[in-house]
Every structure is written in C-alpha cells, then in structure tokens.
Interface confidence: low
Amino acid sequence: EAHKSEIAHRFKDLGEQHFKGLVLIAFSQYLQKCPYEEHIKLVQEVTDFAKTCVADENAENCDKSIHTLFGDKLCAIPKLRDNYGELADCCAKQEPERNECFLQHKDDNPNLPPFQRPEAEAMCTSFQENPTSFLGHYLHEVARRHPYFYAPELLYYAEKYNEVLTQCCTESDKAACLTPKLDAVKEKALVAAVRQRMKCSSMQRFGERAFKAWAVARMSQRFPNAEFAEITKLATDVTKINKECCHGDLLECADDRAELAKYMCENQATISSKLQACCDKPVLQKSQCLAEIEHDNIPADLPSIAADFVEDKEVCKNYAEAKDVFLGTFLYEYSRRHPDYSVSLLLRLAKKYEATLEKCCAEGDPPACYGTVLAEFQPLVEEPKNLVKTNCELYEKLGEYGFQNAVLVRYTQKAPQVSTPTLVEAARNLGRVGTKCCTLPEAQRLPCVEDYLSAILNRLCVLHEKTPVSEKVTKCCSGSLVERRPCFSALTVDETYVPKEFKAETFTFHSDICTLPDKEKQIKKQTALAELVKHKPKATEDQLKTVMGDFAQFVDKCCKAADKDNCFATEGPNLVARSKEALA
C-alpha cells in the first residue's frame, strides 16, 4: 500500500528507538570517517523531521523518498569534499543515481584504527551514565567498519551488548564477567559481518536470481516440511529484505524483516514445528532466533529424488515449459533431503543438473543421456567431504594457532602477491573454521565448513578487488560465487612469482612485542611467517618450523631478559642470520 509520507510510515512501524538506531547505522555506513557527534546530530534532525511528518503527512518535504531525505542531509555536511574527496561528486547527481554513487564509495577496508574495548570500569561508568549514547557509539563504530553489516541484526547485537553490560556492571569483578560475554558477542558479530558481505556480493555481482536460489536451498534445508510454494514465498521475501539492506534502504529492510517474522509466526503450521520458542520473543530477538533456527525433522516418507527428476519421462517437457520453476523444485527437493550439505554444494549440484538437462534435452535420447546425472554428482559431493576431513584432522593435530599457520603458508604460496596484512587476516579467519566447525557432529560439519569458508574467501575477494595484484585470485574471484571455494582449494604454488628479497628489517623486533596481548603477538609472528614464505615460496614445512621455532624462542628469551632492548638488539641479527641459513 502506498503511503503519503514514507518516513512517517517507517517511523510509526519501527518506533523511535529502532528508527534512530537504523538512521545512525545508515549514516555511519555511508560516511565512514565522520565522528559520532556529527552523525548523532544528523540522526536527531532526521528524527525530529520524521516526527513532524507523523503529526502531519502533508507537511513540507514529507512526501520525499527516504533516499532523497538522507542524501540531502549527507550532502549538506560542511567540508564533505575535504574529508571524502570524490564521494562529494555524488551530490551533483539526482536520485536514484546519487544513492548508487554513495554505495559505490563504501569502503570495505576503511583506514580506521581497530576497535579498542575500553577497560571494564570505564566502560561501566560511561554505560551507566548514558546507556543510549554508549550503545549509539557501539552502533557507529561497528557500522563504519562494516559498511554492509545487516542493520536489523546490528540492532540485535547492540541489544545483546546492552544486556551484558547491564548484568556485569553491577558485579564485583566486572572484567571477569564482561570479557567472555563480550568476546562471544564480538565473535558472532564478526561472522555475521562476513556472511552479510557475501550476500551483498551475491546480490551485486549476480543479481536477485542467484540470491533467491541461495535462499531456496537454505530455507528448504531448515523447513523440509514446508511446501515448495511456501519456501518460494519465504525466499522471495528474504531476497527483497537483503536487497534493501545491501542497497542502503535500512528502514524498509528492518520493517520488512519484522513483517516476515510476524508472517512466519502466524503460519508456523505450514512452515516448521520448531518456531514457537522464537515467536514468544520481542521483535529483534524473534527475527534473530528465526534466522538461526534449527532444522525441522525431515519427513519420513520422502520418495527418491530420481522419481521426478530422472525417471519421469516428462523431464525435458517439464524443464522446457518452466525452467526456473522446475530447477527451483529440484533445488527444493534435493535441499530438504540434505541438511548435511552446504548451500554452496547444493547450488553446484543444481547447476550440474541444469547443464545436464540443457545438453541432454537437445539430443536424440534424452532419458538415456540424463539417466546417470545423480551418479555424476558423486565427485562434486566427495570433494568438499574430503576437504572437511583433511582440514579437521589437521586442526585436531595442530590446534587453532598451528592450523592458522598452516593455512597462512598454503595461501601465501597460492597468492604471494597479496599484501601480508590481507593474507594474515584471511588465514586467521580461515583457520578459525576448525574451532567453529570441526567440533560439531558429523552431519553439521560440511555445511558449517564450506559456507563459512565461502564467506571468508568473499572478504578476500572484496579486498583484492580494491587493489588487484594476483591473476590467480582475480580468476577465482571473477567466477561463480559457488565455485570460489573449490577454485581457491585447487590453487597450487604460484610458479610465476619472483621471490621477495630478504630484508633484515622485516624480521627485526623490539621489546614492545613483549607487552602485546596474545592475539597481537600471534599476528606479529604470522606476519613474519608470511614474509618468510614470500622470500622462499618453496620452503619445506621443516624449514619453516625450524625458523618459526627459533623465532618463538628468541622472543621468549628476550622478553624474560633483564635488559630487553639490549637482548633484541644483539640477538636479533643472529636470528636473521640463522634464518637465512636455514632457508638457503
């Protein structure tokens, strides 16, 4: 239904609190360098304006689109060109081109310092003195570092943050209470960020059809008792919601997401038997709970997939009459039978089935041609299963840090031209797959591993796109989204790479490493490891182990020394010499 004033409509639907949070996220994702104070001023102005439109939908400018209103606000910021350079050129355009222009200037790797968590006491004081401002800062800091973060989900994490602080700030040992709880929220939020970026990449590069296929597979796995028509409706809605959020229409996105949650809860009987617990929660928690819902039980009486898609004599006729519906039905039927497969794998199988029909239905004896298609799926299924098996075994043997290092060596050899910070970030994230997935029951491992790896590799692609340096990475990133992970897995040592010169300063360390938190120490060591591989791409595992072991001992020894600076200054050159020798 059309509304006279879009902004009044959204304000009424969302409520002031969520409206303000979403506007703050929107501004922070568009203008990532502006300080909180500047954004909050704009948020208040937009909120006050929305309230006037609620009171009188015919008031001046209330009929303007939200993009127009937001864009006008952003373009009115003084010194926009000084701070944002060519982004200011967007302001010369009209909607919808202006918004498209803003979207293109979103920076996936903004030059911002890492988000530092304040000390527990200070955190609690500022939270208790002004919880709204404290959580506003949280939204701002996360949104500007993750310009594609799914906005309604970020509101949910802010709510979680709020709950943790409220609980822990009245405890005697605040830090002991806060640290593990906030670490857990942070970990979940970071995974959510890369997953959503992948969804937006899918939408941007391959359009709504590709995203909807992903949604059909995912929904079919979760709700195997739902009819195909129901799954299609849910997938269409989810596609619309994600398109809105990826496109910067955050108010509409959050509103539609709440509507979808409402619809699902009103139609549990035709969707899933597992929804009730979610449906009793408030709106943000309800939507999040539904997004994370466990799979419903698979119906006991499902016939073989072959009946309708291989043995039926009308396969080619059904395919020709309505290709998308027929392939959608195949994806639905296959996915609901396989909650143990990754969505990427299910989409590869659907693609293989489509290619088989395209070829066979044009031949003289189609049934004879496509009759073996299900058997031809086997190698496609075995490949990710083997990937999971070998990587989980390696993780169990080495632990998270050792596994990250193994992945770092592997990926530096595959793409040594990529910058060391990007390789270290990617390897650390890829390496976390072990902790995240390898401890799960067998049936959950494959979907967890492959879909997580795909999201992390998408982040690598997004960063590489900004400054392309490796032809191999470009090739894997340019292809289909579902083929990326197999493409990266298949890469071997880049033979075209000319090894980096050995620079002593790259391996020179100072006493400041001693006071770093464990995570930062690990990153320093992993940076050195990547640089070693760039110097000697064909170094053996034993050579690298020797050098890294020597390095760890050197750091340990000097950090325990009475005169740390002197130890680093004198022992450092010896370490460099020994390392060069070990790698010769």
């Epitope: 709510e159 405890e171 408030p282």
Partner: nanobody
C-alpha cells in the same frame, strides 16, 4: 507481576534530608541490580545511583556523590536512597527501577519502573 512502589518523597528546605524507600515484589529482588533515576520538571531522565544484588558495587552520578547513599535490605525486598544536603536542583520525581531483559536498545525502556515519588527542595 513486577511491582515497584516508591515512598518517602516530600517538600524539604535546601540543606535538608529525606529517605526514599522502594518496596519490590514479583521478581527475584535479591539477585537483581537496582537503580534510582530521577526526572526534573521539563527535563529528561537522569541516572542517580546503582547498587548490585549483594550491595558490594555501588555507583553514584557526579551530581549526587557525597550527599546521597543507596542501600538495600534483601530480607525486606526494599531499596533505599538516603538524601542529605539537598539542593534546589535535586527537585524531581525519583523512580526506582530494575533491568528487564532488553526489548529495545540502550534506553530506560529496558527497565521495570515504579510510579515515582516527588521530592521538592525549596526555601
């Protein structure tokens, strides 16, 4: 059903004292952190003080430090606020509140409230 009932407000001269009480029921008082919040005429809500469930953690807003004392009696399910050296700017409705697992982000809407008790400081 959660109930918080404040009492002890009234009119007092600058420099005077009052003791506010808050009787709690309908939730696990002895395991809940409690707060006092106030709202001066025509102003927004202002956090005054927090006390943890076991009373080991106590915090005050800068504006009341050294003058107000928060305390609780878990056996009686009651929260207190002793207010000394009262000033004209302390005039407000005082509410006691306890956190409710959040339905919104970072706002006082996250709390269960009492109906408030009015404190007026005037010469």
């Amino acid at each position: 059903e959660v109930q918080l009932v404040e009492s002890g407000g009234g009119e007092v001269q600058p420099g005077g004292s009052l003791r506010l009480s808050c009787a709690a029921s309908g939730f696990a008082f002895s395991t809940s952190g409690m707060v006092w919040v106030r709202q001066a005429p025509g102003k927004g809500l202002e956090w005054v003080s927090t006390i943890s469930d076991d009373a080991r953690i106590i915090r005050y807003a800068e504006s009341v430090k050294g003058r107000f004392t928060i305390s609780r009696d878990n056996a009686k399910n009651t929260l207190y606020l002793q207010m000394n050296s009262l000033r004209a700017e302390d005039t407000a409705v005082y509410y006691c509140a306890t956190y409710r697992a959040g339905s919104r982000i970072g706002s006082y809407e996250d709390y269960y409230w009492g109906q408030g008790t009015l404190v007026t400081v005037k010469p």
